[in-house]
């Protein structure tokens, strides 16, 4: 177990702070909650706290959630490839390009890391060449989110890990918009941190909202687990 | 569980002693034949605020006794699209506040119990 791995084995509390722009709309969004390592859960809420969020709330999961990776269900034949909770508690630098299918992107960049007991994760985002009748700042995305697999090999130059995957969200149409995500994470550290083979995440996520919560808001509930590298033969034979 | 007549009442109860660590939210799910399990209800325990499925609001009401750690389910005016499996389940987490919890997904919860049959006839 890496010492960073020790810190996830009960309910951790989730802290999500992002400060957005996206063709001149400012805006920013808080988000709270608990997530769960053993079970690869997670649970939050978020709230625009400036009034009415400029994009749809399905574009801003993967910056929200997809990002406190750490939170992933590592299988323990799997746990020497868990980057994420082996860079905590200083934590990990996440960097993402979103590229939305004939429209804008959106830059990312994030700092993940525990402040006392709470895994934060600070956000900044940049969006840019977006249409203004597209499906993203026309709102004219479906409120749901699709199953997806998160990518991840390591990038021995910078000790951390790049990442990719192809997200689809469904329009009101019945087409998809498809993001494709560039990511790369970087240790905050200089401790040791796990450089894994290649695998991926396995994710599922579900949009609700609250019926109590005025404010425009999403509730979030995710599952992921971490998969693609088998046991080896030595394994198999114990 | 039981078989009850449309427009009767019947009350699940379900003990959660033997979790392992205490749990966050509490709900009960159904499962009918040949349909996916889905949320019925759930409770937070720490806040008592409880969230309901479209399909059995007004109807159904669910509760916990945290002294004797068992969570309960009220289901009056039953009608027979209410004929399932019903199971208890808990999450370590924070209960998932929705709008209309059959939506939220059999993922959130970590614990479940082994099920009780409830048949009700027109």
């Known amino acids: 177990m890496s010492k960073g791995e020790e810190l996830f084995t009960g309910v951790v509390p989730i802290l999500v702070e992002l400060d957005g722009d996206v063709n001149g709309h400012k805006f920013s969004v808080s988000g709270e909650g608990e997530g769960d390592a053993t079970y690869g859960k997670l649970t939050l809420k978020f709230i625009c706290t400036t009034g009415k969020l400029p994009v749809p709330w399905p574009t801003l999961v993967t910056t929200f959630s997809y990002g406190v990776q750490c939170f992933s269900r590592y299988p323990d034949h799997m746990k020497q490839h868990d980057f994420f909770k082996s860079a905590m508690p200083e934590g990990y630098v996440q960097e993402r390009t979103i590229f939305f299918k004939d429209d804008g992107n959106y830059k990312t960049r994030a700092e993940v890391k525990f402040e006392g007991d709470t895994l934060v994760n600070r956000i900044e985002l940049k969006g840019i060449d977006f249409k203004e009748d597209g499906n993203i700042l026309g709102h004219k995305l479906e409120y749901n989110y699709n199953s997806h697999n998160v990518y991840i090999m390591a990038d021995k130059q910078k000790n951390g890990i790049k990442v990719n995957f192809k997200i689809r969200h469904n329009i009101e149409d019945g087409s998809v918009q498809l993001a494709d995500h560039y990511q790369q994470n970087t240790p905050i550290g200089d401790g040791p941190v796990l450089l894994p083979d290649n695998h991926y995440l396995s994710t599922q996520s579900a949009l609700s909202k609250d019926p109590n919560e005025k404010r425009d808001h999403m509730v979030l509930l995710e599952f992921v687990t971490a998969a693609g590298i088998t046991h080896g033969m030595d394994e198999l034979y114990k | 569980g039981g078989s009850v007549q449309a427009g009767g009442s019947l009350r699940l109860s379900c003990s959660a002693s033997?979790?392992?660590?205490?749990?966050?939210?509490m709900a009960w799910f159904r499962q009918a034949p040949g349909k996916e399990r889905e949320g019925v209800a759930e409770?937070?325990?720490?806040?008592?605020?409880?969230y309901y499925a479209d399909s059995v609001k007004g109807r159904f009401t669910i509760s916990q006794d945290n002294a004797k750690n068992t969570l309960y389910l009220q289901m009056n005016s039953l009608k027979p699209e209410d004929t399932a499996i019903y199971y208890c389940?808990?999450?370590?987490?924070?209960?998932?506040?929705?709008?209309?919890?059959?939506?939220?997904?059999?993922?959130?919860?970590?614990?479940w119990g082994k099920g009780t049959q409830v048949t009700v006839s027109s």
């Open positions: 033997g979790f392992a660590s205490s749990p966050g939210c």
């Open positions: 389940a808990a999450s370590r987490l924070r209960c998932t506040p929705a709008a209309d919890f059959s939506r939220i997904p059999a993922y959130a919860m970590d614990y």
């Open positions: 409770i937070a325990t720490r806040s008592g605020s409880a």
